[in-house]
Interface confidence: low
């Protein structure tokens, strides 16, 4: 169900607050903003159009509202007059609307507060931090945000102090932040400055693009490595395992068949110490954009179960391809009976089960395109009684 | 919203050349194949090119192979056509075409609304 | 190349009504696309993989086939349904489209 939520629900005068909306529907036209309990375009704020990225003032609009693509509705410099109740209104792709309405309440603004940390430049899963909330004040209730969000339910968060001190143990990553701390008492509240983190990590193991393995000879190779990493990552190339040059992006011109290979980068941390590889074939081919339509040929259709085994063949003139099989729309092989073999060309059953008659296809794709065979019957008979000398019972 | 906006059409001279373009938004461009179809006035689609994802891979029917090329800027998500040794008969709307971003991406996921390209003295 | 040709070139057909659109390849084809097209407007992909119903498009269409021959159905005709429909292959170079079929009101 659509919702909406006020962050804070309690303002100080002066600041802003954020109509956050939860459970939006997927496939939307767009979003519009009320003041008060219903739809009422007298006193419309603001509409947003999904289609265009347009945001539309309307009457109740003070050029202090900002909508976000998510719908939420930011309002800075509030006052008292602002408090009561805001309805958004989401109009889905089958036009059918859907309402929802939150409320905030604005009141005199406390002293701003801030931020003392221990430690602002942690290691990865090493490191703790502790985060307290200044002034100390009576009366006063202490609130975490992270991310602009409330604190999630984590381990690895503890409060303490009431709640004036936020430690974080064994921080990661995505701790940068930006942390806040909020204070209220029931007249009024206020938050921090944001703190973030300088965490250092990595590097993770790095990507190399583009993804196109294929490429034309003549064509120039210009590949780029990327790992995640804080301080940024130093980067190395290999070809084939021969190290080329210490550079984050790899070019080679006008390249033929004899630059398919194994492209290696490697990347460098020297704070953490860590290094990582990634290894892209490169295959410099003439690659056709469609391959051609394969033939399967089996060894024979008929065969007889518990006794006869059968070789199917994927035959096709196309390169730089891959095979896959299929029998009654699931893909093979589907039991240890069903052996493949000769990159895949061929799929062989031994012994034949009754369960293996049916129809049965091959596809071959390579990264453009795939095609697959017309489709081959395999028949499985039983005998009802064994024969002799290829005699049938008298 | 998927958004492909062609420009560069016009009115030529036979022989002459034009440069088309195509911006594109709302999808991440450099992961999927890009096309031009062409529609002379009245009549129906005809295939005039298309290029991979990455730009490695350029394809081109025999009525313009060698007269038409493209090529992308995946940094500016821009596709382009360029039309040298133009003729009458390529006078049509020409279309910009997104293909779906798997590799069996031999259909034209999104067009555009087409720009008018017309050849004559 | 591959030729394909639909049938029939006008269909003449009230609301409400059945319309099968049949689109034939000289050759055996993997797959088939179908655009719909109004005056004015670019093509819209209609169906893709021969049976695939593309994003918006109302479950009164159908597509079916394989081999040469494959059919568009419109179980029952809504106003905004006339246009006119091509089909598509890329099963082998180049890709073709059908001449296309005009569904006009009757």
């Known amino acids: 169900q659509l919702t909406t939520e006020s962050m804070p629900f309690n303002v100080a005068e002066g600041k802003e607050v954020l109509l956050l909306v939860h459970n939006l529907p997927q496939q939307l036209f767009g979003y519009s903003w009320y003041k008060g309990e219903r739809v009422d375009g007298n006193r419309q704020i603001v509409g947003y159009a999904i289609g265009t990225q347009q945001a539309t003032p309307g009457p109740a609009n003070s050029g202090r509202e900002t909508i976000y693509p998510n719908a939420s509705l930011l309002i800075q410099n509030v006052t008292q007059n602002d408090t009561g109740f805001y309805t958004l209104q989401v109009i889905k792709s089958d036009l059918v609307n859907e309402e929802a309405t939150g409320q905030f309440h604005v009141y005199p603004e406390l002293p701003k507060p801030s931020i003392s940390s221990n430690n602002s430049n942690p290691v990865e899963d090493k490191d703790a931090v502790a985060f307290t909330c200044e002034p100390e004040t009576q009366d006063t209730t202490y609130l975490w945000w992270i991310n602009n969000q409330s604190l999630p339910v984590s381990p690895r968060l503890q409060l303490s102090n009431g709640n004036r001190t936020l430690t974080l143990l064994s921080v990661t990553r995505n701790d940068t932040g930006p942390y806040e701390c909020e204070i209220q008492n029931p007249v009024s509240a206020n938050r921090s400055d944001p703190v973030t983190l300088n965490v250092t990590y990595g590097p993770d193991t790095p990507t190399i693009s583009p993804s196109d393995t294929y490429y034309r000879p003549g064509a120039n190779l210009s590949l780029s490595c990327y790992a995640a990493s804080n301080p940024p990552a130093q980067y190395s190339w290999l070809i084939n395992g021969t190290f080329q040059q210490s550079t984050q992006e790899l070019f080679i011109p006008n390249i033929t068949v004899n630059n398919s290979g194994s492209y290696t980068c490697h990347a460098n941390n020297s704070v953490t110490g860590c290094n990582r590889t990634t290894v892209k074939t490169i295959i410099v081919t003439e690659l056709s954009p469609v391959v051609a339509k394969p033939q399967i040929k089996a060894s024979k259709t008929t065969v007889t179960g518990d006794k006869d085994s059968v070789n199917l063949t994927c035959s096709t003139n196309d390169t730089g391809i891959s095979i896959r099989w299929f029998f009654k729309n699931q893909s093979l092989p589907s039991s240890e009976r069903m052996k493949l073999s000769q990159g895949n060309t061929t799929l062989s059953i031994n012994p034949v089960k009754r369960e293996d008659a049916g129809t049965y296809w091959c596809e071959v794709f390579n990264p453009i395109s795939k095609n697959q065979s017309d489709p081959i019957m395999l028949n499985v008979n039983y005998n009802a009684l064994p024969q002799e000398n290829g005699l049938s019972p008298g | 919203e998927v958004q492909l906006l062609e420009s560069g059409g016009g009115l030529v001279q036979p022989g002459g050349s034009l440069r088309l373009s195509c911006a594109a938004s709302?999808?991440?461009?450099?992961?999927?194949?890009m096309s031009w179809v062409r529609q002379a006035p009245g009549k129906g689609l005809e295939w005039v090119a298309t290029i991979s994802s990455g730009g490695t891979y350029t394809y081109y029917p025999d009525s313009v192979k060698g007269r038409f090329t493209i090529s992308r800027d995946n940094s500016k998500n821009t596709l382009y056509l360029q039309m040298n040794s133009l003729k009458a008969e390529d006078t049509a709307m020409y279309y910009c075409?997104?293909?779906?971003?798997?590799?069996?991406?031999?259909?034209?996921?999104?067009w555009g609304q087409g720009t008018l390209v017309t050849v004559s003295s | 190349e591959i030729v394909l040709t639909q049938s029939p070139a006008t269909l003449s057909l009230s609301p409400g009504e059945r319309a099968t659109l049949s689109c034939r390849a000289n050759s055996a084809v993997s797959y088939m696309y179908w655009y719909q097209q109004k005056p004015g407007q670019a093509p819209r992909p209609w169906i893709y993989l021969t049976s695939n119903r593309a994003t918006g498009v109302p479950a009164r269409f159908s597509g079916s086939g394989s081999g040469t021959d494959y059919t568009l159905t419109i179980s029952s005709l809504e106003p905004e349904d006339f246009a006119v429909y091509y089909c598509q292959q890329w099963s082998s170079n180049p890709p073709t489209f059908g001449q296309g079929t005009k569904l006009e009101i009757k």
């Open positions: 709302g999808f991440i461009f450099s992961s999927h194949g």
């Open positions: 075409a997104k293909h779906p971003p798997d590799y069996f991406a031999a259909w034209f996921a999104y």
